[in-house]
Amino acid sequence: KRFHDVLGNERPSAYMREHNQLNGWSSDENDWNEKLYPVWKRGDMRWKNSWKGGRVQAVLTSDSPALVGSNITFVVNLVFPRCQKEDANGNIVYEKNCRNEAGLSADPYVYNWTAWSEDSDGENGTGQSHHNVFPDGKPFPHHPGWRRWNFVYVFHTLGQYFQKLGRCSVRVSVNTANVTLGPQLMEVTVYRRHGRAYVPIAQVKDVYVVTDQIPVFVTMSQKNDRNSSDETFLKDLPITFDVLIHDPSHFLNYSTINYKWSFGDNTGLFVSINHTVNHTYVLNGTFSLNLTVKAAAPGPCPPPPPPPPRPPKPTPSLGPAGDNPLGLSEIPDENCQINRYGHFQATITIVEGILEVNIIQTTDVLMLVPGPDSSLIDFVVTCQGSIPTEVCTIISDPTCEITQNAVCSPVDVDEMCLLTVRRAFNGSGTYCVNLTLGDDTSLALTSTLISVPDRDPASSLRMAN
């Protein structure tokens, strides 16, 4: 059998095979050692017994999408049946005091591979044996502790495969320079040690995407905005737009990146080299936000221009350089740059909101019958922007970290936006007061530290903003 007979049905065309050479990967036309690595079709009854105590689940993840030319990383995590785990030696053991369908196990091991490998024979002086090989016959890499690695992972994509020895997690990075754009399929088959052979325990596949568009995400935030995820923001307050380029392998690390913004409010184009920008909308309504990101990324060099036709006889004026039609200075540099673009579009809604809130006065309320430990304090509050519908006060310790009391109540405020909020304080001392005014779309906060005096008529209230 060949690798492509074993590893999935996707058969790339000859063009795909030729144009998607992955560095360090091998052609799936190579022979597969079925004696050491048996092949079972989906639905084969042997899968049921491939692992003691249930089925092993392989979870394949990737950091797709990948900009063409960058590295894409794949990780496979093995999830064992309940009550089973991998120990420090790579053996699979039962968790202590864990009960599964079979009850508590007397044998601590599910698979004691250490014992198997110490027992193995047929090895020469290098520790190599006929069974410590991959499906294509390549020997296992011999680094310290390799015997603790009891799983063989075979990755397969684009008509090529990659073999890796590992534990319950493995990671493979692939350079996408030669990968065709669009969605591609990665398939992984996992084998476990079984004496001097291997047994398949899991298969998993996942789609990854290679793109020539820079993957761009934008987060939008604004002070006083009640819900940052609804794309509704407030008039007359700056919105912070922060661009995140999905580039986990830092392919664009040394690129000059330009951000071209159109905010859709007739303020024209704004070009920046900073990934963060602030913009204030001064009108209510719905606006179309557009961002274009441009980066000069490493890319393939264009083919050299064809040489000019050679004259039939050497011309004296050309001199010895005549054998170099490009001229020395024109030899193409293999580290070429290519402009890559990314786009982001969003529709945002701008509405009125509470822009600012201020405590302009605090007054100790003199009670005719003062409580033993209680002080009433009035906060006179003003606001700008829309009219609030609720007020919340959070009273906490002087560091503003440990909340002691929180109260919210509806308010009815006139257009001048002047209101008095009365709150009770238990005992003297210094308090942090957070006062928030809110409506459907906005939430404006102000804070103050106040000192509540002892109930001594001579003492007065102090406020420090």
Epitope: V59, T61, S62, D63, N71, T73, F74, V75, N77, V79, F80, K85, E86, E95, H143, P144, C168, S169, R171, S173, P248, S249, H250
Partner: antibody
Framework: EVQLQQSGPELVKPGASVKISCKAS????????MNWVRQSHGKSLEWIGD????????TYNQKIKVKATLTVDKSSSTAYMELRSLTSEDSAVYYC?????????WGQGTTLTVSS | DIQMTQSPASLSASVGETVTITCRAS??????LVWYQQKQGKSPQLLVY???TLAEGVPSRFSGSGSGTQFSLKISSLQPEDFGSYYC??????????FGGGTKLEIK
């Protein structure tokens, strides 16, 4: 015995660059990923990125705005992290740590102070 | 990215007591979780990996449990050398592998 020996403390000005080293001994350097983790004063740990010393391929944490470049010198079994365009927010203890996907041995840490 | 939330942020206990620290993941991470211990002014040290497996040389009074999104680290019969900070970290899927906010364990 596995050991990761990091370079000494650094005091640099905002906008400058710094290169921290981590010399590995007691194991085969190219067999394990080398990670870099930072810890701002009194804060939690943040993974910066890792490098595969075998071929030099690196992966970074995009969520933290650290301008880091990871490199290795296989001949001296040393990993390096260069930090550029430093600001006061980059002041922290920087650790190198071995292995993937969790870290079984850590360097002693390099304290970086960015101050004018 | 997967977020890790650790609680409590700090806790006081006496030698001989048993304490439990919890860690919650924002999505299913199966059993791919580690715990580290960090003493004041020192580097973190690996305690537990794969949620339940004790690292080499870690005393058996430490035990990890949980899977999916909820995890805990239990320290039975606290010893003086156990005081310090503890961090959880997931190791599922592709990087970044985020840490919890930490739990500071102090002597009462």
């Amino acid at each position: 015995e596995v050991q990761l020996q990091q370079s000494g403390p650094e005091l640099v000005k905002p906008g400058a660059s710094v290169k921290i080293s981590c010399k590995a001994s007691g194991y085969t350097f190219t067999d394990y990923y080398m990670n870099w983790v930072r810890q701002s004063h009194g804060k939690s740990l943040e993974w910066i990125g890792d490098i595969n010393p075998y071929h030099g391929g690196s992966t970074y944490n995009q969520k933290i705005k650290v301008k880091a470049t990871l490199t290795v010198d296989k001949s001296s079994s040393t990993a390096y992290m260069e930090l550029r365009s430093l600001t006061s927010e980059d002041s922290a203890v920087y650790y190198c740590a071995r292995n993937w996907p969790y870290f079984d041995y850590w360097g002693q840490g390099t304290t970086l102070t960015v101050s004018s | 990215d997967i977020q890790m939330t650790q609680s409590p942020a700090s806790l006081s206990a006496s030698v001989g007591e048993t304490v439990t620290i919890t860690c919650r993941a924002s999505e299913n991470i199966y059993s791919f979780l580690v715990w580290y211990q960090q003493k004041q002014g020192k580097s973190p040290q690996l305690l537990v990996y794969n949620a339940k497996t004790l690292a080499e040389g870690v005393p058996s009074r430490f035990s990890g449990s949980g899977s999916g999104t909820q995890f805990s680290l239990k320290i039975s019969s606290l010893q003086p050398e156990d005081f310090g900070s503890y961090y959880c970290q997931h190791h599922f899927g592709t990087p970044p592998y985020t840490f919890g906010g930490g739990t500071k364990l102090e002597i009462k």
